[in-house]
């Protein structure tokens, strides 16, 4: 799986979208989890409604919400009041039994509020970082990591 980077501003909301094949994942609940450390498990943050037919209903856990468009095949996660500690590696998952398939790996980046006594010139925006100069930008807050730019490279 490629990793897609979503950027949000501290104090604001960030929407993460995870597209999937609606036929392949028909009848499956979805979840959003956070990768703990380099080799740790993916800790469940929030999952869709227990009844798959009600997956369109938004479910909250703290400041994180999840909703699933099962016909269109798009899982949407909202992180409200984004904070620095929300930055990290996450996964969108499709659940079946005790197993979970990864729909998308997501790297959440939190930017400082440009209005919070900061100069816009100090902030980084997609396309301006040498590390990601060839990365594919899906929209204003999302981009894919290049091959080899994995967040948790093997320990040297």
């Amino acid at each position: 799986h490629n990793t897609t980077v979503f950027q949000g501003v501290a104090g604001q909301s960030l929407q993460v979208s995870c597209p999937y094949d609606s036929m392949k994942h028909w009848g499956r609940r979805k979840a959003w989890c956070r990768q703990l450390g380099e080799k740790g498990p993916c800790q469940r943050v929030v999952s869709t409604h227990n009844l798959w037919l009600l997956s369109f209903l938004r479910r909250w856990n703290g400041s994180t919400a999840i909703t699933d468009d099962t016909l269109g095949g798009t899982l949407t996660i909202t992180l409200r009041n984004l904070q620095p500690h929300d930055a990290g590696l996450y996964q969108c998952q499709s659940l079946h039994g005790s197993e979970a398939d990864t729909l998308r790996k997501v790297l959440v980046e939190v930017l400082a509020d440009p209005l919070d006594h900061r100069d816009a010139g100090d902030l980084w925006f997609p396309g301006e970082s040498e590390s990601f100069e060839d990365a594919h930008v899906e929209h204003s807050i999302s981009r894919s990591l290049l091959e080899g730019e994995i967040p948790f490279p093997p320990t040297s």
Epitope: A10, G37, E38, Q83, P84, H85, D86, A87, G88, L89, L107, E109, V110, L111, A112, D122, L123, W124, S129, E130, S131, F132, E149, I150, P151, F152, P153, P154, T155, S156
Partner: antibody
Framework: QVQLVQSGAEVKKPGSSVKVSCKAS????????ISWVRQAPGQGLEWMGG????????NYAQKFQGRVTITADESTSTAYMELSSLRSEDTAVYYC???????????????WGQGTLVTVSS | EIVLTQSPATLSLSPGERATLSCRAS??????LAWYQQKPGQAPRLLIY???NRATGIPARFSGSGSGTDFTLTISSLEPEDFAVYYC?????????FGGGTKVEIK
């Protein structure tokens, strides 16, 4: 075991700039916060700013905004802190520190460099 | 910015005594708080992270507690090597500020 090795002591003139390096070895680099902390003689610790190399975006304390630039080179596992328009009050030991956990939530400083003494004097 | 106020500024105690150091935040930092020990001429050393988790290799006599705005570092029985300056730091929001420090000195 992670090690952070900083560049050597510097003596600078007021108005000039200094660039201190911090090379990390013995562990991964990309997803861990690197913070820069300074300590003036006989004073406490002062957080200047930090960066997560994989993101490339640095965050700075208001006090240093516009004067400090923090960067990281993933290819060499090296972080840099450049402070410009130096004045005598900038005389201090400058430390780099790496988080013990990944990203900002793990930015408690588990590993520290040996410190770099920067003396600003005319 | 979040201001961390440490008290007392100086604590004069004898070896074997219990030391209680306080760190108060100007607003909630949840549990995103660390404690460091620093001796003269040395870099700081991490003692506690996430308010109550002891770092690897730190003796059990060091313990941290609290959440929100009030935090405590306790040294249950002071050893000669514990006399140093102690700092708290928050890392919930930028800038990641430090407290002014508490010096634990031999009485």
């Amino acid at each position: 075991q992670v090690q952070l090795v900083q560049s050597g002591a510097e003596v600078k003139k007021p108005g000039s700039s200094v660039k201190v390096s911090c090379k990390a070895s013995g562990g991964t680099f990309s997803s861990y916060a690197i913070s820069w902390v300074r300590q003036a003689p006989g004073q406490g610790l002062e957080w200047m700013g930090g960066i997560i190399p994989i993101f490339g975006t640095a965050n700075y304390a208001q006090k240093f905004q516009g004067r400090v630039t923090i960067t990281a080179d993933e290819s060499t596992s090296t972080a840099y802190m450049e402070l410009s328009s130096l004045r005598s009050e900038d005389t201090a030991v400058y430390y780099c520190a790496r988080g013990g956990g990944t990203f900002w939530s793990g930015s408690w400083a588990l590993y520290w460099g040996q410190g770099t003494l920067v003396t600003v004097s005319s | 910015e979040i201001v961390l106020t440490q008290s007392p500024a100086t604590l004069s105690l004898s070896p074997g005594e219990r030391a209680t150091l306080s760190c108060r935040a100007s607003q909630s930092v949840s549990s995103y708080l660390a404690w460091y020990q620093q001796k003269p001429g040395q870099a700081p050393r991490l003692l506690i992270y996430d308010a109550s988790n002891r770092a690897t290799g730190i003796p059990a006599r060091f313990s941290g507690s609290g959440s929100g705005t009030d935090f405590t570092l306790t040294i249950s029985s002071l050893e000669p090597e514990d006399f140093a300056v102690y700092y708290c730091q928050q890392y919930v929001n930028w800038p990641f500020t430090f407290g002014g420090g508490t010096k634990v000195e031999i009485k």
